[in-house]
């Protein structure tokens, strides 16, 4: 069948007033024109420029789209550039848009704007918007648009401007035909021919099923005026989950997958992973294996380690150090982690609760990449259950038992905690005596107090020490008028406590005459 | 129908101000820009400026810019042309013109009556 | 600044005489420059502007032409309501009228 151009409107063919719906009436006005000729004609012309938010609507007269499918849309137009009008940069534009509307019958005069689709933005050519200012170069812009395919009778064009200077000087609706084809995976419509401009029309191609456009490289067939279809440029690929054969996509079969259509063919499945259908992007993992959000599709599916392998330990009072060798299985990644969790049972029935927080851990308790670890500040003569579970990139996918190595211990015994209450009793000229309180925690049976005293000038680079079995003592042979610094601390066989606070006490003056002087009442004197 | 009205005519001495309304009617105001014209007794029309009735830009012909100011009162569509430090040469009727722009080109499709200012001691 | 000259200064004819009006530009301007007609007495009045477009209720007697510098008006048959002064105005970056055609009863 030879192809035709079939003419549906020409309005510049028609002499009489074209009297098609302007919406609102001051918009779009009907005036004679000059086509590229300069033959008087028909034109519809708009120069709203200078309110913002226009909204001027056109709408041709019903056409009847005849045998069409596919519909081609002249638009020769002259456009203004707005920087040849004073003052109206703010709301002056350079497109307008182009709508149509689908029915079976004409609808009458009302534009209802919410059903018409539109085709697009229509602007001019930029070398023909770039005149000198001084003269206002407007030369006859030529676009062209396809719009189908169409399903009813026919149709309705409008044009939309939201604030141009612009005359559309000719409209021309029409069809020809290249028949329908498949090239490279693309399907190339029946389509419009060249028109009298050119001899060739590039038309975009639709991907098949299952197919998408190669990036940046868009399928494009040409028509000829002879409704043959030349120079294939662009094509599709077929989609992830699809290959191709023929001018078709097919489903990649069971177990196997096709992630990206940049992939040519489809893949047989990685380890440990299946595809039970048709049409696969990826691959299940099989039950007990998992993919980590990171891992590519082409990647084996893989498994949380199993437990850390000889677990030792070694006490030190109330630090514990652990050591252990990595685990048998590392579930097939190489992002093994270890990490603690600490328990402290009671002495019956075993019950165990989380630490808590004032346990420390060296280097850290959490994401270890060593294997070995200090755990620190725990309580003298408790039981403790330490849990090492060794931890990669699907472990917390898997909903089945964590597998771990685990130690049970008992701390010794702690040094005491700080004395606390350190009071001065009396203060004499040359004897200082104290009292304090046991510590909150001896951790054990106090063997003694240890005093540590120091004129507070000599700022501990000399000081003195005295020892004592109770909680007050007498200290003596001190120099009268000095100000002395003092601080307690409780001994366990255990080791020593922190000393308390620092206690300032100043002995008195000495008198003028000799006074009498009472003696300590500690047992315990300072040696002299 | 779109009428655009001018008050009637002044006298005025030299050095004195005059300001010149012009009243818009039958269509949106700052639709359509506004422009100034003067013609001098027996002599041709001269193009002043024109003002962007929705923005209130005004652009000034050469020769007409310092002692010429264009402004608007949009809430009664009325322009003004007022004229400072008024010289005896100032004397002229005043136009007001509604600008009409198109594709095609601009003009000026609707006018006021004119105002005749006449400026002597 | 485009300068527009119009000639004859005085256009004398007769009633359903062709008058014909020159409007010449000191350079290329783009578009058919507007035309007015002013009678004494009055406002000025457009008469056609752009692509040789008529203004509301001017009679298809009047018809502008011409391109490039060169621009003409012409009125195909006198009536008398017609004798006036007729000025043509270019639009560039700055508007200027032409110093204007009388045209009066021969």
């Known amino acids: 069948q030879a192809a035709k151009e079939v003419l549906l409107l020409d309005s510049k063919a028609q002499q009489t007033e074209l009297e098609w719906i302007s919406s609102p009436p001051s918009g779009w006005e009907e005036i004679s024109g000059l086509d590229e000729n300069y033959t008087p004609i028909r034109t519809y012309q708009v120069c709203q420029v200078m309110e913002p938010n226009q909204n001027n609507w056109l709408r041709t007269n019903w056409i009847s789209k005849g045998n069409a499918q596919r519909i081609f849309v002249e638009l020769k137009f002259t456009l203004r550039d707005c920087n040849s009008l004073p003052g109206v940069l703010g709301t002056c534009k350079e497109t307008f848009n182009l709508y149509y509307y689908e029915t079976d019958y004409d609808t009458g005069r009302n534009i209802r704007e919410n059903l018409y689709v539109k085709i697009d933005t229509i602007a001019a050519d930029e070398s023909f918007t770039q005149g000198d200012l001084g003269e206002r170069k407007m030369k006859l812009n030529t676009e062209v648009r396809e719009i189908g395919p169409l399903s009813k009778k026919g149709f309705y064009l409008a044009f939309q401007d939201v604030g141009a200077c612009i005359a559309l000087v000719s409209v021309k609706v029409y069809y020809k035909k290249c028949w329908s084809i498949v090239e490279n995976l693309a399907v190339f419509p029946d389509t419009v021919t060249g028109s009298e401009f050119s001899s060739l029309v590039e038309v975009r191609g639709t991907c098949v099923s299952s197919a998408e456009e190669e990036a940046e490289n868009s399928p494009r067939m040409h028509c000829s005026a002879e409704g043959e279809w030349l120079v294939p440029i662009g094509k599709c690929i077929c989609k992830a989950g699809y290959q191709q054969k023929g001018d078709t996509c097919e489903p990649c079969g069971r177990r196997f997958y096709k992630s990206s259509s940049q992939d040519l063919q489809c893949s047989r499945c990685p380890t440990h992973s299946f595809s039970d259908r048709e049409g696969s992007s990826r691959c299940e993992c099989e039950d007990g294996y998992y993919r980590a959000p990171s891992d590519p599709p082409y990647v084996a599916c893989t498994r949380p380690p199993s437990a850390p392998q000889n677990l030792i330990f070694n006490i030190n009072q109330t630090t514990v150090s652990l050591e252990w060798s990595p685990p048998a299985d590392n579930g097939g990644r190489n992002d093994v982690t270890y990490r603690i969790l600490c328990k402290r049972c009671s002495w019956e029935q075993g019950e165990c609760v989380p630490c808590g927080s004032n346990i420390g851990y060296m280097p850290q308790q959490t994401g270890l990449e060593d294997n070995y670890v200090t755990v620190m500040d725990l309580l003298a003569h408790a039981n403790y259950t330490f849990e090492v579970e060794a931890v990669n990139g699907v472990s917390d996918l898997s909903r089945s038992q964590r597998l771990f190595a685990a130690v049970s211990i008992t701390t010794g015994q702690a040094a005491p905690s700080q004395v606390s209450g350190v009071m001065k009793e009396r203060v004499l000229q040359r004897s200082v005596q104290l009292s304090w309180q046991e510590p909150e925690h001896p951790n054990g049976v106090i063997t003694e107090y240890e005093i540590k005293y120091y004129e507070k000038d000599q700022r501990e680079r000399t000081y003195s020490t005295l020892k004592t079995k109770s909680t007050s003592a007498s200290i003596n042979n001190l120099k009268p008028g000095t100000v002395y610094v003092f601080q307690i601390r409780a001994v366990t066989a255990a080791g020593y406590g922190n000393y308390s606070p620092r206690l300032d006490v100043a002995t008195l003056e000495e008198a003028s005459g000799k006074m009498f002087e009472a003696t300590a009442v500690s047992s315990e004197q300072n040696p002299v | 129908q779109v009428q655009l009205l001018q008050s009637g005519a002044e006298v005025k001495k030299p050095g004195a101000s005059v300001k010149v309304p012009c009243k818009a009617s039958g269509y949106t105001f700052t639709s359509r820009a506004m422009s100034w014209v003067r013609q001098a007794p027996g002599q041709g029309l001269e193009w002043m400026g024109w003002?962007?009735?929705?923005?209130?830009?005004?652009t000034y012909a050469q020769g007409f810019t310092g002692r010429f100011v264009f402004s608007l009162d949009t809430s009664v569509s009325t322009a003004y042309l007022q004229i400072s430090s008024l010289k005896a040469e100032d004397t002229a009727v005043y136009y007001c013109?509604?600008?009409?722009?198109?594709?095609?080109?601009?003009?000026?499709?609707?006018w006021g009556q004119g105002t005749l200012v006449t400026v002597s001691s | 600044e485009i300068v527009l000259t119009q000639s004859p200064a005085t256009l004398s004819v007769s009633p359903g005489e062709r008058a014909t009006l020159s409007c010449r530009a000191s350079q290329s301007v783009s578009s058919n420059p507007p035309w007015y007609q002013q009678k004494p007495g009055q406002a000025p009045r457009l008469l056609i502007y752009g692509a040789s477009t008529r203004a509301t209720g001017i009679p298809d007697r009047f018809s502008a032409s011409g391109s490039g510098t060169d621009f003409t008006l012409t009125i195909s048959r006198v009536e008398p309501e017609d004798f006036a002064v007729y000025y043509c105005q270019q639009y560039g970056s700055s508007w200027t009228f032409g110093q204007g055609t009388k045209v009066e009863i021969k």
């Open positions: 013109a509604r600008v009409r722009l198109t594709v095609y080109g601009d003009g000026m499709d609707v």
């Open positions: 003002i962007n009735t929705n923005t209130g830009n005004p």
